[in-house]
């Protein structure tokens, strides 16, 4: 779509005559008729295919034509067209004499034509005016013309429609050739795609307006290049969303199970050596002179009653020393100078001679011990209570006072929080020092596996022989689509080798 513009500039008819040679009375009141049509090698009669236009009376005999375009007037003359400009044309301009105000052809005198010009040629779309002058025997017409595109039309033949816009359907202005030129911050064929914040991750980020970076689910950070770990992940990281890859020394679904208690808590005291022995579990190997679960108790070397035969023990800086009773000698008073004749056995112990009477041994009644049955049995010396339980002597027996979370004769049993089966949907219960933890089966989550979540039943690759696996989201089950030559719910059987059924 465009406009052929014709600017009439000057018409000369010095003698004021008509084409017939007859003079106008009193002068030639001149108006113009213009016919624009498709190119014809010889301008022929027929429709003005590109349009026609007439002017009012513009002057008498010879006159210059005023440019009226600024005042919304008729010069230049406008011949609009609504097709692709072909680049060629034929133009006919007729000058007519109008004695009165009625310019209709049938109202004019029979010989009212003053002059007629017909030109044809090529004309490219453009802003520049082509100046032309046509002379006949008695008249001369000076004019210029051009073809320009209508608003929103562009290109060599005004065939490209382009309307600048800045809305949901595009953000662009139009170049002279009709191509789109995107506004800053926009891209794409129709400039509908915003240019995101520089560095915004191509896959994990997006934007709805320029210089924005919105993260897709599972990603975070200014540029959406940081994954979000699994909710509740304590001592872990991720490389893809919802992962929880445990830091060194941590385990469990949420990396909250301490596998390196020694490093994280340094429980062993007094220079003891700590060894990890499982989840939240450790063993302290005490340096000499210390005891207790965490080697927190200073040990007197006399506590182990090293002196025999009633010898009394004295602590020393570099160890201990046994003061032996009469008739005994040696580091631990282990050697006797006595015999059965000396009645060395106390508390009803019976004496047996050895080495032809050179030595003896006492057989002690219950609850007494020592080489001379001189000691009451301390049932706690073997430290029988497990898990840090405290041993108490109670007459002929002993008893363990257990630490919280342990039970049993020797505190060997954990008090189980798991006994009441708190984990739903087949979750596995783990006792912890301060409570319990449920490990949920696929498809469930929550502290007690009470929340049903959608799972990808295909994640475990259950289908054989390159079958395609599809997840049934309504039942969280899978369906295998077998390739040619295989059957079975998992495509595990080759065709022709049916499974052996028991019936």
């Amino acid at each position: 779509s465009g406009v052929f513009q014709l600017q009439l500039q000057e018409f000369i008819n010095e003698r004021g005559v008509l084409a017939s040679g007859r003079p106008c009375e009193p002068g030639c009141r001149t108006f113009f008729r213009v016919c624009l049509k498709h190119f014809q090698a010889v301008v022929s009669p027929g429709p003005c295919t590109f349009g026609t236009v007439s002017t009012p009376v513009l002057g008498t005999n010879s006159f210059a034509v005023r440019d009226d375009s600024s005042g919304g007037g008729r010069n230049p003359l406008q011949l609009p067209f609504n097709f692709t400009w072909p680049g060629t044309f034929s133009l006919i301009i007729e000058a007519w004499h109008a004695p009165g105000d009625d310019l209709r052809p049938e109202a004019l005198p029979p010989d009212a034509l003053i002059s007629k010009i017909a030109i044809q040629g090529s004309l490219a779309v453009g802003q520049n005016w082509l100046l032309d002058e046509q002379t006949s025997t008695l008249t001369r017409l000076r004019y210029s013309y051009r073809v320009i595109c209508s608003d929103n039309y562009y290109g060599d033949n005004c065939s490209r429609l382009c309307k600048k816009r800045n809305d949901h359907f595009g953000h662009y202005v139009c170049q002279p050739d009709g191509n789109l030129s995107c506004l800053p911050g926009w891209t794409g064929e129709y400039c509908q795609q915003p240019i995101c914040l520089s560095g915004c991750h191509e896959q994990n980020g997006y934007c709805s307006k320029p210089a924005e970076c919105l993260c897709r689910p599972g990603w975070q950070g200014r540029l959406c290049n940081e994954c979000i770990p699994h909710n509740g992940c304590r001592h872990g990281t991720c490389s893809t969303p919802w992962q929880c890859t445990c830091d060194e020394g941590w385990g469990g679904l949420f990396c909250d199970q301490d596998l390196n208690y020694c490093t994280h808590h340094s429980p062993c005291k007094n220079g003891a050596t700590c060894s990890n022995s499982g989840q939240r579990s450790y063993t302290c190997t005490c340096r000499p002179g210390y005891t207790g679960v965490d080697c927190e108790l200073e040990l007197s070397e006399c506590d182990s009653n090293p002196c025999r035969n009633g010898g009394s023990c004295k602590d020393q800086e570099d160890g201990y020393h046994c003061l032996c009773p009469p008739g005994y000698y040696g580091l631990h008073c282990e050697h006797s100078t006595l015999s059965c004749a000396d009645s060395p056995c106390f508390n009803g112990g019976s004496c047996r001679e050895r080495n032809q009477g050179a030595n003896y041994a006492c057989e002690c009644p219950p609850n007494f011990t020592g080489s001379n049955c001189e000691k009451k049995v301390d049932r706690c010396t073997s430290n029988p209570c497990a898990n840090g339980g405290q041993c108490l002597n109670r007459g002929p027996s002993r008893m363990c006072r257990c630490r919280p979370g342990f039970t049993g004769t020797y505190c060997e049993l954990h008090v189980s929080d798991c006994a009441r089966n708190p984990c739903a949907h087949g979750g596995t219960c783990h006792d912890l020092e301060n409570g319990l933890m449920c490990t949920c089966p696929a498809g469930f989550s929550g502290r007690r596996c009470e929340v049903r979540t959608s799972i990808d039943a295909c994640a475990s690759s259950p289908c054989f022989n390159r079958a395609t696996c599809y997840t049934d989201l309504s039942t969280d089950t899978f369906v295998c689509n077998c390739p040619y030559g295989f059957v079975g719910s998992r495509c595990e059987f080759p065709v022709g080798l049916p499974p052996s059924f028991p019936w």
Epitope: A19, P45, G46, P47, T49, P109, P110, D111, L113, K116
Partner: antibody, heavy 119, light 111 residues
Framework: EVQLQQSGPELVKTGASVKISCKAS????????IHWVKQSHGKSLEWIGY????????NYNQKFKGKATFTVDTSSSTAFMQFNSLTSEDSAVYYC????????????WGQGTSVTVSS | DIVLTQSPASLAVSLGQRATISCRAS??????????MKWFQQKPGQPPKLLIY???NQGSGVPARFSGSGSGTDFSLNIHPMEEDDTAMYFC?????????FGGGTKLEIK
């Protein structure tokens, strides 16, 4: 009132020439074109060509090139068609009609001139 | 040359009824949205008279019962209601290309 007045009937010998006239009145002769059309007895119409009454530019049907010649006399507002080397095939009624650049078509016709070619 | 084929060659229509004459061109006679097709009426001993130009526009002084339609290669002239005075030969004519050509004509009579 627009009128196209053609010359009278012609009886001519084979090989001779004939010149038919068409005098226009009631309109600005030079602004228009004059067409010439042949109609053989009981047959359809055949376009011979046209002439611009303003500058004498012509356009002929290839079939009649060399056979027909168009001229105009603007001073008398008359168009002429000369037919050469006549044969019996040229016996027909010949019409003139006016036409204009701002297409209506051949809106006014002459009454026709009958040409009979005899041996 | 563009060949124009008219049908039927002759037609008899009752007074007050509709007469339809067709004209088919051997190639399109349209250019820049205008159909270069005209219709003429010719009565015996008279010159042709312009009825329709540019396929559907009525010539000066032509009664409204004459109407034209079509584009490209297929055109028709309709006369409704048919009157006594409409007995004549009817010709289509194209002016898109030189040489201008006419159809063979259709003879319309009263039934």
């Amino acid at each position: 009132e627009v009128q196209l007045q053609q010359s009278g009937p012609e009886l001519v010998k084979t090989g001779a020439s004939v010149k038919i006239s068409c005098k226009a009145s009631g309109y600005s002769f030079t602004a228009y074109y004059i067409h010439w059309v042949k109609q053989s007895h009981g047959k359809s119409l055949e376009w011979i060509g046209y002439i611009s009454c303003y500058n004498g530019a012509t356009n002929y049907n290839q079939k009649f090139k060399g056979k027909a010649t168009f001229t105009v006399d603007t001073s008398s507002s008359t168009a002429f068609m000369q037919f050469n080397s006549l044969t019996s095939e040229d016996s027909a009624v010949y019409y003139c009609a006016r036409d204009y650049d701002y297409d209506v078509g051949m809106d006014y016709w002459g009454q026709g001139t009958s040409v009979t070619v005899s041996s | 040359d563009i060949v124009l084929t008219q049908s039927p060659a002759s037609l008899a229509v009752s007074l007050g009824q509709r007469a339809t004459i067709s004209c088919r061109a051997s190639e399109s006679v349209d250019n820049y949205g205008i159909s270069f097709m005209k219709w003429f009426q010719q009565k015996p001993g008279q010159p042709p008279k312009l009825l329709i130009y540019a396929a559907s526009n009525q010539g000066s002084g032509v009664p409204a019962r004459f109407s034209g339609s079509g584009s490209g290669t297929d055109f028709s002239l309709n006369i409704h209601p048919m009157e006594e005075d409409d007995t004549a030969m009817y010709f289509c004519q194209q002016s898109k290309e030189v040489p201008w050509t006419f159809g063979g004509g259709t003879k319309l009579e009263i039934k």
